[in-house]
Interface confidence: medium
Amino acid sequence: DSEEDEEHTIITDTELPPLKLMHSFCAFKADDGPCKAIMKRFFFNIFTRQCEEFIYGGCEGNQNRFESLEECKKMCTRDNANRIIKTTLQQEKPDFCFLEEDPGICRGYITRYFYNNQTKQCERFKYGGCLGNMNNFETLEECKNICEDGPNGFQVDNYGTQLNAVNNSLTPQSTKVPSLFEFHGPSWCLTPADRGLCRANENRFYYNSVIGKCRPFKYSGCGGNENNFTSKQECLRACKKGFIQRISKGGLIKTKRKRKKQRVKIAYEEIFVKNM
């Protein structure tokens, strides 16, 4: 396929990598819905990778909502060890690993970790609590997994999805569906195209995980979700590489994936200026 480069990867039986998603809806944000009831429910938080409590309003919302902590854990976490993928070629670091640490404008004094491109190591810094850039990790382990050199492990999971005939959107299935593909790219690649709330008509691309291709759509200029790219190439880079086609029961498989951080923030850039 001329649209994207390929890497070869080998499956090895070792420890689980950090993120253990079993269903795509486990990546959805907690949604309290528009109603005003106060109901204690649980959702899976992809950033903390834990089931957490939230208050549900009683109507609408999404599938990342469970009556009990146990049900949430059962649906969204895995206790059994699984396989991880090790790349035979060196993984390319995400661009944000090369950003300098950014405290943000606020005045908190929170310990965070960033990848220092000079020392090639993850180091501690003090974060102000708001804004900042993506080179900002809550744990040293997360920083190392994403930005430091060495083999990166990825969770291998199946995601069952179906096309909703009414609005042509992606609907996650509540049960695992056998699939020719396994997805461990950014969770937003599984979400439907979302025009957003404004009135513009900007040409954008989204990843359609049902057909496995990047498709154009009209973006309103604000809102929407992260499955939104300014070019087809950017879309393919971010999402197409997340799918692994299973060509045999084990051994060598093809992957089209470069590691991306789950949290999405607009990156700051350092600027150097001279006094005029």
Epitope: C106, C130, E270
Partner: antibody, heavy 121, light 108 residues
Framework: QVQLQQSGPGLVKPSQTLSLTCAIS??????????WSWIRQSPGRGLEWLGF?????????DYAVSVKSRITINPDTSKNQFSLQLNSVTPEDTAVYYC???????????WGQGTLVTVSS | DIVLTQSPATLSLSPGERATLSCRAS???????LAWYQQKPGQAPRLLIY???NRATGVPARFSGSGSGTDFTLTISSLEPEDFAVYYC?????????FGQGTKVEIK
Amino acid sequence: QVQLQQSGPGLVKPSQTLSLTCAISGDSVSSNSAAWSWIRQSPGRGLEWLGFIYYRSKWYNDYAVSVKSRITINPDTSKNQFSLQLNSVTPEDTAVYYCARHNPDLGFDYWGQGTLVTVSS
Amino acid sequence: DIVLTQSPATLSLSPGERATLSCRASQNVSSNYLAWYQQKPGQAPRLLIYDASNRATGVPARFSGSGSGTDFTLTISSLEPEDFAVYYCQQFYDSPQTFGQGTKVEIK
């Protein structure tokens, strides 16, 4: 009392560069406890934050994605001011442009008077 | 981006009445980073409320803010003639910082 005084042309031709300056009195552009922003307002878009600069032992900036490829905000410490440059403007960039101080404890607590910039040939 | 949706778009009330303006965020926002502004025609916005519930300097006590998470409210307990204006909420919890589309409070 902090005051922000804006200056710059009100008419810019399409494809040219919009340049505005915001002079600060009562605070320093190099303050370790503020950020200096540009915000614009048009009927179609409402209030739209464009970007800011701030100093925390070195200079940082952040720009809105919608203008990131065209915008530059620079401080001028000698004159205690900061500037906005927006390249390759189109009629869509017609708006009232405001400079503002972003106090991290409060929000935008001081604003310039606003400059209506019309992009037209 | 965090989208802030304000409702209603327009509120038609008489002086002396109570105004309740809503701001709903598309995802959680720390209340420390949620502000409200008032804007009158031909003027720059003016900071009214910070940290979701604290009045800025010089703001009358009839203005109050409340809320947390994704739902925030600005209340004007008894409208004065000078309160008829457009009100905006704003978050600077996550980059890029964003404003709501505004609620216009007009005289009935």
